[in-house]
């Protein structure tokens, strides 16, 4: 039995930050779980991890180069990514594992979310002409 994951197909980070919500077909309340966010088509790079259990507060881990926070809902984990760079534009996959209580469960691979990081374009400053010469 696998957990199903729903993600937005695409998110645009205009201000170098984005909220990626991973919605699960499973209630995480009073469970020991590990939710993770993976970068790239092959999910090769794990960039963010949220660990939760029934007795401790949520623990969030960010890989070097990523600034990540996590929020838990009953059937969701939202990853808040900040200070993103244009070159971190990629597809990101949510993963979930539930360890306790048994049985161990994980998810069917989701379709992923393309996060498009828009560069900050500085607005050209208005031209102030100097004093006119006769």
């Amino acid at each position: 039995n696998k957990i199903l994951v729903k993600q937005s197909p695409m998110l645009v980070a205009y201000d170098n930050a984005v909220n990626l919500s991973c919605k699960y077909s499973y209630n995480l309340f009073s469970r020991e779980f590990r939710a993770s966010l993976h970068k790239g088509l092959d999910s090769a790079v794990e960039v963010c991890v949220v660990y939760g259990n029934y007795s401790q507060q949520l623990q969030v881990y960010s890989k070097t180069g990523f600034n990540c926070d996590g929020k838990l809902g009953n059937e969701s984990v939202t990853f808040y990514l900040q200070n993103l760079y244009v070159n971190q534009t990629d597809i990101y996959f949510c993963k979930i594992e539930v360890m306790y209580p048994p049985p161990y469960l994980d998810n069917e691979k989701s379709n992923g979310t393309i996060i498009h990081v828009k560069g900050k374009h500085l607005c050209p400053s208005p031209l102030f002409p100097g004093p006119s010469k006769p």
Epitope: E46, V49, Y51, Q59, Y61, T64, E97, M99
Partner: nanobody, 124 residues
């Protein structure tokens, strides 16, 4: 809950070698990392080396690069630290740590569980 048991510490002469082991037990996920930190008397606990479960990510402190090698046997849930060309400044209590992060983190705060430590003494 994860338990960590270290072994392999001892006394060795400068230039000698030691191999530390750290066995983990408890509930494990599909990816996590284990690392070695050390603490010399009167000093902060500092990062030595770390490796993740998939063995595709390892990291070392600059001071041990080329001398120490971290490896792991996933079937035994055990991490090893092979220490060669030991120096007097390597003398410390070596602690094994466990983190739910899936990469070789050098950040002490990322580690959730610690072993009891094993003493390594390098002296002529």
């Amino acid at each position: 809950e994860v338990q960590l048991v270290e072994s392999g510490g001892g006394e060795v002469q400068p230039g000698g070698s030691l191999r530390l082991s750290c066995a983990a037990s408890g509930r494990m996920f599909s990816n996590y990392a284990m690392g070695w930190f050390r603490q010399a008397p009167g000093k902060e606990r500092e990062f030595v080396a770390a490796i993740n479960y998939r063995r595709d990510d390892a990291d070392y402190a600059e001071s041990v690069k080329g001398r120490f090698t971290i490896s792991r046997d996933n079937a035994k849930n055990t991490v090893y630290l092979q220490m060669n060309s030991l120096r007097a400044e390597d003398t410390a209590i070596y602690y094994c740590g466990f983190t739910y992060a899936g990469w070789a983190s050098s950040r002490r705060d990322d580690y959730n569980y610690w072993g009891q430590g094993t003493l390594v003494t390098v002296k002529p």
